[in-house]
């Protein structure tokens, strides 16, 4: 009667421990589906912000920082006020960002289109020789393919021209202690899906 | 997918205004400048001037100043070219390009005025 | 104002043929050039900045080198679409201004 009783025993313990490795199955499925769900829900909080940012230049879904551009995957802020360049990489970091790293061909455009004054101010990027006469890197230490923009010497500037500033959509080397205005730039964060709630009263207004 | 769509065609007499409008979409107005350029029937390609999308500052080469008005809508995405007492060598297409004045990577589809008493 | 003088004019080839446009600036323009072609009744297309290079999704059968005042655009082995008018414009400050243009015609 007791081995019976064990041996029924043996059956519900195996059972249960069935059950629990099902169960265990249908959770691990559950958190899979849930990721991948999230990821979906990211990437279209993530569109439709784009779409609310590019109508209006501004959005709260935005995930920049208040007064910061949101560019491609980056937000950006164009300062007036003129710094030496490496007071400017002193200010990004102040701010929990660096200078202006140009990548690729629409982040000139933009820099350009933003940077661009009837009244000749340049601002500095994160490019620097920090060997007099050698390569050109960014800040990150990433080098400069000259593909993407031609640096002219600017041969007035009485020092060393290691420091590269952008002047209306042309790209000068200049004495890093001139004065040009800053350029900061920080990765764009995750743009919440909860900022997106729109009151059911907006609906189909402006469209 | 960004698109720069302008308006259709317009037939003016001489002294008449025309307002052209140039709607982009597929990124933020507001990140690059808009630059006009005209082109002349058979003829090349000239640069007007561009407004700031960001201050709404217009700037106009030396031959479009006077009779000629950048604005925006920038809630519509929208730039707006003017051309106010039309004269006959205003018969042309007019472009909208994208970007600060450098290249232009996307153009408008151009709207022809023609002027014609 | 900077000048841009494009030759020739006018130009015939065949398809499969490789044809070279110049253009030349009045002053330097550093490698500030870019070109575009149009065809007609079209808007013009963007081919090529910094004066060597090539727009995203252009065919690398177009090619630009030069510097200074000195630029041309090379066309390898041409295909039936490339056909039209090419315009090089510098982008050195303002005002920008374009070549009269040079238009590629099928022999």
């Known amino acids: 009667q007791y081995y019976q009783l064990s041996n029924t025993g043996q059956d519900t313990i195996s059972q249960m421990e069935e059950r629990l490795g099902n169960t265990s199955q249908e959770l691990q499925s559950l958190q899979v589906q849930n990721i991948k769900l999230a990821g979906s829900l990211q990437h279209v909080a993530e569109k439709l912000c784009r779409e609310l940012y590019n109508k209006a230049g501004a959005h709260r879904c935005s995930p920049c920082t208040e007064q910061w551009k949101w560019h491609g995957d980056n937000c950006y802020q164009f300062y007036k006020d003129s710094k030496s360049w490496e007071d400017c990489k002193y200010f990004c970091l102040s701010e929990n960002s660096t200078m202006l790293k140009i990548n690729k061909q629409e982040d000139l455009e933009f820099a350009a289109s933003q940077s661009y004054s009837e009244f000749f101010y340049s601002y500095w990027t994160g490019l620097l020789r920090p060997d007099s006469g050698k390569a050109w890197l960014w800040m990150d230490g990433t080098p400069f393919t000259s593909e993407l923009f031609h640096i002219i010497i600017d041969v007035t500037s009485p020092r060393s021209r290691d420091c590269v500033a952008i002047l209306n959509g042309m790209i000068f080397s200049k004495d890093c202690k001139e004065l040009k205005r800053c350029v900061c730039e920080r990765r764009a964060g995750m743009v919440k899906p909860e900022s997106l709630h729109v009151p059911p009263e907006t609906l189909g207004e402006g469209d | 997918q960004i698109h720069l769509v302008q308006s259709g065609p317009e037939l003016k007499k001489p002294g008449e205004t025309v307002k052209i409008s140039c709607k982009a979409s597929g990124y933020t107005f507001t990140n690059f400048g808009m630059n006009w350029v005209k082109q002349a029937p058979g003829k090349g390609l000239k640069w007007m001037g561009w407004?700031?999308?960001?201050?709404?500052?217009?700037t106009y080469a030396d031959d479009f100043k006077g009779r000629f008005a950048f604005s925006l809508e920038t809630s519509a995405s929208t730039a707006y070219l003017q051309i106010n007492n039309l004269k006959n060598e205003d018969t042309a297409t007019y472009f909208c390009?994208?970007?600060?004045?450098?290249?232009?990577?996307?153009w408008g589809q151009g709207t022809l005025v023609t002027v014609s008493a | 104002d900077i000048q841009m003088t494009q030759s020739p004019a006018s130009l015939s080839a065949s398809v499969g043929e490789t044809v070279t446009i110049t253009c030349r600036a009045t002053?330097?323009?550093?490698?500030?050039l870019a070109w575009y072609q149009q065809k007609q009744g079209k808007s013009p297309q963007f081919l090529v900045y910094?004066?060597?290079t090539l727009a995203e999704g252009m065919p690398s059968r177009f090619s630009g080198s030069g510097s200074g005042t000195q630029f041309s655009l090379k066309i390898n082995i041409l295909q039936p679409e490339d056909f039209g008018t090419y315009y090089c414009q510098h982008h050195f400050g303002t005002p920008l201004t374009f070549g009269a243009g040079t238009k590629l015609e099928l022999k």
């Open positions: 407004i700031n999308t960001n201050t709404g500052e217009p």
């Open positions: 390009a994208r970007g600060a004045p450098a290249w232009f990577t996307y």
């Open positions: 002053e330097n323009i550093y490698s500030y």
């Open positions: 910094n004066a060597k």
